[in-house]
């Protein structure tokens, strides 16, 4: 905290300008009027205040707005945002996407800080849902944003927002998150034709059930191995050799290189060796000929 001292004669700031950078911290405290600062916040970012001087400016705003800053001030915080704590931000009511963008710009190129996480949380909660424009903005600044949300939080994403999602935005999502996002994507893209639909849905397929994979296998989609390897193991296991062959198309040859990795390894163990041999890839580990396969889960269901 800066001590209260009288402003030296002739140093009272008539406006917020660059002459203030040469003021000592106590002079800034004594000679800059908080109300003037609030009305001229748009100038602050263009002035090369030091990080220490920004402390004083923050202190002045805190005194002026003990219940939290108005959006007119928040919008122009610029580098002052770096001085805010999550506790400060929880007092704010940010409704404008432009304000959000302006503050995210300050943190650009850095990992998501607790301040940014709190800001986003406040903004999204205020909006009630993660709409397309917000998601567009957030994933532009933080490609991993979507995958940082819990499945519960993702459930509030409307299907219309899925159009804003790029493949790289899903890179770090786990199966539980894709389980939530996939049905939304399916709904969002349902009116697209086959090949266009596959291009859009491809990055969400880690959440697809068996019946959807079976349906895709009938559409000559030629799924690449990278996508196939991200599918849910439980969704892949019931697929027949013929269905996998149709699903992968020319990429089926890549199964050989992945035969020791999930889900390929587990899928191989469920197939008849005879059927695997028809692929001509030398895949080993299938069920030997003459063995009877009992589906115990089916038996339990019948009893």
């Amino acid at each position: 905290e800066v001590e209260k001292t009288a402003c030296p004669s002739g140093k009272k700031a008539p406006e917020i300008d660059e002459s203030l950078i040469f003021y000592k911290k106590w002079e800034l405290e004594a000679c800059v009027d908080a109300a003037l600062l609030a009305t001229q916040m748009d100038r602050v970012n263009a002035i090369p205040f030091t990080y220490e001087q920004l402390d004083v400016l923050k202190h002045k705003l805190d005194e002026l707005y003990p219940q939290g800053y108005p959006e007119s001030v928040i919008q122009h915080l610029g580098y002052l945002f770096l001085k805010m704590s999550p506790e400060d931000i929880r007092k704010w009511n940010v409704t404008s996407l432009e304000t959000l963008k302006a503050l995210l710009e300050v943190n650009k190129g850095h990992e998501m800080s607790p301040q940014v996480a709190t800001l986003i949380d406040r903004f999204v909660k205020g909006r009630g849902q993660l709409d397309k424009d917000t998601l567009d903005t957030l994933t532009a600044f933080y490609p991993g944003y979507l995958c940082s949300l819990s499945p519960e939080e993702l459930s509030s994403v409307p299907p219309s927002s899925i159009w804003a999602v790029r493949p790289q935005d899903l890179d770090t999502c786990d199966p539980r998150q894709l389980d939530v996002l996939y049905p939304k994507a399916r709904l969002a893209f349902q009116n697209m034709n086959g090949s266009e639909y596959f291009v859009k849905i491809q990055s969400f397929l880690g959440g697809a059930p068996t019946e959807d994979l079976k349906a895709l296998s009938q559409q000559n989609v030629s799924m690449d191995l990278a996508t196939f390897m991200k599918l849910r193991t439980d969704a892949v296991l019931p697929l027949t050799v013929a269905e996998v062959q149709k699903l992968l198309g020319p990429h089926v040859e890549g199964l050989k290189a992945e035969e020791r990795h999930r889900p390929v390894r587990d899928w191989i163990l469920r197939q008849r060796q005879d059927d695997l041999d028809t692929l001509g890839l030398g895949l080993q580990g299938g069920i030997p000929n003459g063995y009877l396969v009992l589906d115990l889960s089916m038996q339990e269901a019948l009893s």
Epitope: F22, A46, P48, T50, Y51, E52, Y79, L82
Partner: antibody, heavy 119, light 107 residues
């Protein structure tokens, strides 16, 4: 990558002026302040001042106010510093440097220009 | 103006040593201090910023510490390529000021 290119050396006569250049590449020139720093042989570094290429706004160390004039040419992404009324005290290496805002430490330095004032 | 004092102009060292270079500010600068390394004929290179944060690509044998008026740059395992001049800089207030430098030499 981010680079600040400066001419290697300038030989000037006492009383004359010299205009040093600093050509920026690898980043958006108009988005960063450009600072200038002086280093005399075997001595420390002295901050001269800074200019914002977008606005042309300048701020000087009081000590160099009557010695240095900072300008920019946005079209060529080049910053300039004119030094006037040169004396042997001005013989030094001059660096341009890009700061990290709002912390004002320098993550990118120019290659430096050695100014020699001699008759 | 804030004066940054590096009391040792020269320091003798050997490879493998732990070396501590000090810098004292004439008034409180918080943690607004950076450290630079400069080799002969080269530009300064940023090592440490905000008193203790290592800049990208700087080996972890370099560490910075301190706040207020007293700051230290430590090289935990001196290497021959670390022989250079080291400068501190404060960015708490204008004008920005630097220390006079400490030159590391071989014993």
């Amino acid at each position: 990558q981010v680079q600040l290119q400066q001419p290697g050396a300038e030989l000037v006569k006492p009383g004359a002026s010299v205009k040093l250049s600093c050509k920026a590449s690898g980043y958006t020139f108009t988005s960063y302040w450009m600072h200038w720093v002086k280093q005399r042989p075997g001595q420390g570094l002295e901050w001269i001042g800074m200019i914002h290429p977008n606005s042309g706004s300048t701020n000087y160390n009081e000590k160099f106010k009557s010695k240095a004039t900072l300008t920019v040419d946005k079209s060529s992404s080049t910053a300039y510093m004119q030094l006037s009324s040169l004396t042997s005290e001005d013989s030094a290496v001059y660096y341009c440097a890009r700061p990290v805002v709002p912390y004002w430490y320098f993550d990118v330095w120019g290659t430096g220009t050695t100014v020699t004032v001699s008759s | 103006d804030i004066v940054m004092t590096q009391s040792q102009k020269f320091m003798s060292t050997t490879v493998g040593d732990r070396v501590s270079i000090t810098c004292k500010a004439s008034q409180n600068v918080g943690t607004a201090v950076a450290w630079y390394q400069q080799k002969p004929g080269q530009s300064p290179k940023l090592l440490i910023y905000s008193a203790s944060n290592r800049y990208t690509g700087v080996p972890d044998r370099f560490t910075g510490s301190g706040s207020g008026t007293d700051f230290t740059l430590t090289i935990s395992n001196m290497q021959s390529e670390d022989l250079a001049d080291y400068f501190c800089q404060q960015s708490s207030s204008y004008p920005l000021t630097f220390g006079a430098g400490t030159k590391l030499e071989l014993k």
